[in-house]
Amino acid sequence: MAVTACQGLGFVVSLIGIAGIIAATCMDQWSTQDLYNNPVTAVFNYQGLWRSCVRESSGFTECRGYFTLLGLPAMLQAVRALMIVGIVLGAIGLLVSIFALKCIRIGSMEDSAKANMTLTSGIMFIVSGLCAIAGVSVFANMLVTNFWMSTANMYTGMGGMVQTVQTRYTFGAALFVGWVAGGLTLIGGVMMCIACRGLAPEETNYKAVSYHASGHSVAYKPGGFKASTGFGSNTKNKKIYDGGARTEDEVQSYPSKHDYV
């Protein structure tokens, strides 16, 4: 039950995170005009990964796409790439995790396959979250660098006489959405990996302890009976589901391929 809950929660958290990453990537407010100590402009500027927008005092807003690929800063291209990779990995992870969910039955899919898929989706979510966090952080660093450069030189001279307004930009809403969404996707991925450990079938070589009670023998294995059909049915090397609880014996059992998580 705990595994199902962990897996389900991991999926939901990741889903929210990836939706957030998509939203952040599409948002126009990656950087917004800094209004503090700036020349007071009658227009408000904000920029995204794909276009820049200007809101006039009337509220009329006009956006222009970056209709160039080669003319854009390499850092912006890198941020775009990181966000897109994050979205793609997250989307694939979501697809995989849907089939991995314990509450969804697809044919006669074994728990081992579900465990594999849960781990795969978990890793994908973790990488997706890291991509988003990295992308947003790179952009934020770019903003901070540019902010202090333009603060040092609020007006750039043109031809010695004419001045152009040096607009300073600060963190936009998309950065915070991106950080939170990346974090959620990362947490969701970790939860999926934790759930995978619970789903993982254990190749356990149990030593049966024999108790003599009223003339007939009953093999008893503490902790291992949860998924068994009877008290005496787990004396052989059978695959059992232990719901995440681990006994001292199990800790010393042969390592499963899922135990490295």
């Epitope: 009658a42 227009v43 927008c53 152009t164 307004v165």
Partner: antibody, heavy 119, light 113 residues
Framework: EVQLVESGGGLVQPGGSLRLSCAVS????????MHWVRQAPGKGLEWVAY????????YYADSVKGRFTVSRDNAKNSLYLQMNSLRAEDTAVYYC????????????WGQGTLVTVSS | DIVMTQSPDSLAVSLGERVTMNCKSS????????????LTWYQQKPGQPPKLLIY???TRESGVPDRFSGSGSGTDFTLTISSVQAEDVAVYYC?????????FGQGTKLEIK
């Protein structure tokens, strides 16, 4: 039809105060920013003040900062300019102007009200 | 503050003639975010309030005759009347609508010879 009608102008002594009003009709007043622009007799135009539709942004010309206060009452469709510590150089025709939807332009102007500061 | 300088101060032309007047700002009025120039032109006829002619440096206000056109970018702007009519006698003002305070040029007076 958009109409802006200024009132409250007149003769005032230096150091005195005056409150100009602008009654508007023909458009949704609460959706538009408003300006005050003045024109001294025989001179050019001088922008005085701006107030945004929701009064969040208010800006003044350096020459009137600290002396003039712009305000609005969206319920009454009215714009106001409170002028204190008036000087001779404040003598002008004061126009109430609507801020246009595009390009921050000043698209509709009232006929103006004359303020004369003289002893 | 942005200083707007118009030239010439006045000009007298014959009817049907083409006329151009200039406006220069001390700072660029170009907004890279939307590729717009925040400069506006007004016409003020004697005894009347000003009337909006052109915004965004080159966009004609609705109802303005197409003989009026605006051009320029950054700091240098021009208002052109392709064929002057008698009713065009007025003072023409340019205005910075980019940075507060929103400054006007001193005006260019157009007269008919």
């Amino acid at each position: 039809e958009v109409q802006l009608v200024e009132s409250g102008g007149g003769l005032v002594q230096p150091g005195g105060s005056l409150r100009l009003s602008c009654a508007v009709s023909g458009f949704t007043f609460s959706s538009f920013g408003m300006h005050w622009v003045r024109q001294a007799p025989g001179k050019g135009l001088e922008w005085v003040a701006y107030i945004s539709s929701g009064t969040t942004n208010i800006y003044y010309a350096d020459s009137v900062k600290g002396r003039f206060t712009v305000s609005r009452d969206n319920a009454k469709n009215s714009l106001y300019l409170q002028m204190n510590s008036l000087r001779a150089e404040d003598t002008a025709v004061y126009y109430c102007v609507r801020s246009g939807y595009y390009g921050n332009s000043l698209d509709y102007w009232g006929q103006g009200t004359l303020v004369t500061v003289s002893s | 503050d942005i200083v707007m300088t118009q030239s010439p101060d006045s000009l007298a032309v014959s009817l049907g003639e083409r006329v151009t007047m200039n406006c220069k700002s001390s700072q660029s009025l170009f907004q890279s975010g939307n590729q717009r120039n925040y400069l506006t032109w007004y016409q003020q006829k004697p005894g009347q309030p000003p009337k909006l002619l052109i915004y965004w440096a080159s966009t004609r206000e609705s109802g303005v005759p197409d003989r009026f056109s605006g051009s320029g970018s950054g700091t240098d702007f021009t208002l052109t009347i392709s064929s002057v009519q008698a009713e065009d006698v007025a003072v023409y003002y340019c205005q910075n609508v980019y940075i507060y305070p929103l400054t006007f040029g001193q005006g260019t007076k157009l007269e008919i010879k």
